[in-house]
Interface confidence: low
């Protein structure tokens, strides 16, 4: 009996972690990335009249709980950390398009949801509207990749998320990304990489 776990692309980047979703004994989604969330929140000024907007920097820390589900055309990664004070959900969809050369399938990141608790004291100091908030992406189409390939991008990418905390926008910063939410052929092994344009340019410059 053999259970081969061949995690590719490992590095010593202290911010990065690997997230794996398994179904029916095999890997169906793999994601390796570092993520940070810039979260604005209001605090009372010392006069208790004015509101001041502070900023919490929340890193996705190692040791997070990983869940998810896989499907033919939709896959989801869920990551929970700091005793579930924070939760990240990433929804991936696979679509077929009619091109001049014929049908062409791609997958993309179609939705991001970040749930945070501004009553969590290590990141938020006396937030006025302390409690659970949800920040969602709007009409997202990111990390677009040909079907059967993994997406790789070392460069930083930002995604804006509209928060349920009124008039607040959360910024998600992704870096050192390597993701494959569909069509994993071999257990724990990424397929051929589709590199982001920034990384492609850097390779040409080298």
């Amino acid at each position: 009996e053999q259970e081969v776990e061949n995690l590719s692309g490992l590095s010593t980047n202290p911010e990065k972690d690997i997230f794996v979703v398994r179904e029916n004994g095999t890997t169906c989604l793999m994601a390796e990335f570092a993520a940070k969330f810039i979260v604005p929140y209001d605090v009372w000024a010392s006069n208790y009249v004015d509101l001041i907007t502070e900023q919490a920097d929340i890193a996705l820390t190692r040791g997070a709980e990983v869940k998810g589900r896989c499907g033919h055309s939709q896959s989801e990664l869920q990551v929970f950390w700091v005793d579930r004070a924070y939760a990240l959900k990433m929804l991936f969809v696979k679509e077929s398009h009619n091109m001049s050369k014929g049908p062409e399938a791609t997958w993309r990141l179609s939705k991001v949801q970040f749930v945070y608790d501004s009553s969590e004291k290590t990141h938020f100091k006396d937030a006025v509207s302390a409690g659970k908030h949800t920040a969602n992406s709007h009409h997202l189409s990111a990390l677009v990749t040909p079907a059967g390939k993994s997406y790789e991008c070392q460069a930083q990418q930002t995604i804006s998320l509209a928060s349920s905390d009124p008039q607040k926008t959360v910024t998600m910063i992704l870096s050192a990304v390597h993701i494959q939410p569909f069509d994993i052929i071999s257990d724990f092994v990424f397929s051929e990489e589709h590199k982001c344009p920034v990384d492609e340019r850097e390779q040409l410059e080298e």
């Epitope: 009996e1 053999q2 259970e3 081969v4 776990e5 061949n6 995690l7 490992l10 590095s11 010593t12 690997i18 794996v20 398994r22 179904e23 029916n24 004994g25 040791g63 709980e65 990983v66 869940k67 724990f188």
Partner: antibody, heavy 119, light 106 residues
Framework: EVKLEESGGGLVQPGGSMKLSCTAS????????MDWVRQSPEKGLEWVAE??????????YYAESVKGRFTISRDDSKSSVYLQMNSLRTEDTAIYYC??????????WGQGTSVTVSS | QIVLTQSPAIMSASPGEKVTITCTAS?????MHWFQQKPGTSPKLWIY???YLASGVPTRFSGSGSGTSYSLTISRMEAEDAATYYC?????????FGGGTNLEIK
């Protein structure tokens, strides 16, 4: 916070039986693969058995040295994993640890329970 | 089964010294985990998936390797690093551990 509590160890005669229990908390137990690992001065750290999560139909795996003698089982409703040990031998003497393998490695270890097989 | 051979079995290092512990597998493995154990305590996951530091592990530790050859390195030895370190593979059943390296402080 992840907590693991092993129990059921003690002194048993060669050929005897013993059942170890482990109660876990602080993570989604039904998703976790659970391992038993033992440690003795003679053999060092030795993996004993593994039972996978619900998604993997609770598949079980054993070390050759315990196959046919030990049985691993779990009760997800009680967040517990068990190791039924039969036909015990003196070389089974060790500290037994139950460990969740719910990410990529043996992330958390309890204090272990001591098993002594001696006449 | 895959046999993991650690070397050296016992070593001592002075504070500030660079330390490297190696783990050689009898056949190729996908990646290696490392555990730290101090007397009278349970082992602790120290490095997982070859190069990832477990939570709370000082950044002076690093892990590297591939195939049959893996290593754990401490860039500058400190007194609190004195412990026994074990490598472990979870690529092929049965999961196996190395015999351990007992690292002492001079």
């Amino acid at each position: 916070e992840v907590k693991l509590e092993e129990s059921g160890g003690g002194l048993v005669q060669p050929g005897g039986s013993m059942k170890l229990s482990c109660t876990a908390s602080g993570f989604t137990f039904s998703d976790a693969w659970m391992d038993w690992v033992r440690q003795s001065p003679e053999k060092g750290l030795e993996w004993v058995a593994e039972i996978r999560g619900k998604a993997d139909n609770h598949a079980t795996y054993y070390a050759e040295s315990v196959k046919g003698r030990f049985t691993i089982s779990r009760d997800d409703s009680k967040s517990s994993v068990y190791l039924q040990m039969n036909s015990l031998r003196t070389e089974d003497t060790a500290i037994y640890y139950c460990i969740p393998y719910y990410r990529y490695a043996m992330d958390y270890w309890g204090q272990g329970t001591s098993v002594t097989v001696s006449s | 089964q895959i046999v993991l051979t650690q070397s050296p079995a016992i070593m001592s290092a002075s504070p500030g010294e660079k330390v490297t512990i190696t783990c050689t597998a009898s056949s190729s493995v996908s990646y290696m985990h490392w555990f730290q154990q101090k007397p009278g305590t349970s082992p602790k996951l120290w490095i997982y998936a070859t190069s990832y530091l477990a939570s709370g592990v000082p950044t002076r530790f690093s892990g590297s390797g591939s195939g049959t050859s893996y290593s754990l390195t401490i860039s500058r030895m400190e007194a609190e690093d004195a412990a026994t370190y074990y490598c472990q593979q979870k690529s092929n059943y049965p999961w196996t551990f190395g015999g351990g390296t007992n690292l002492e402080i001079k």
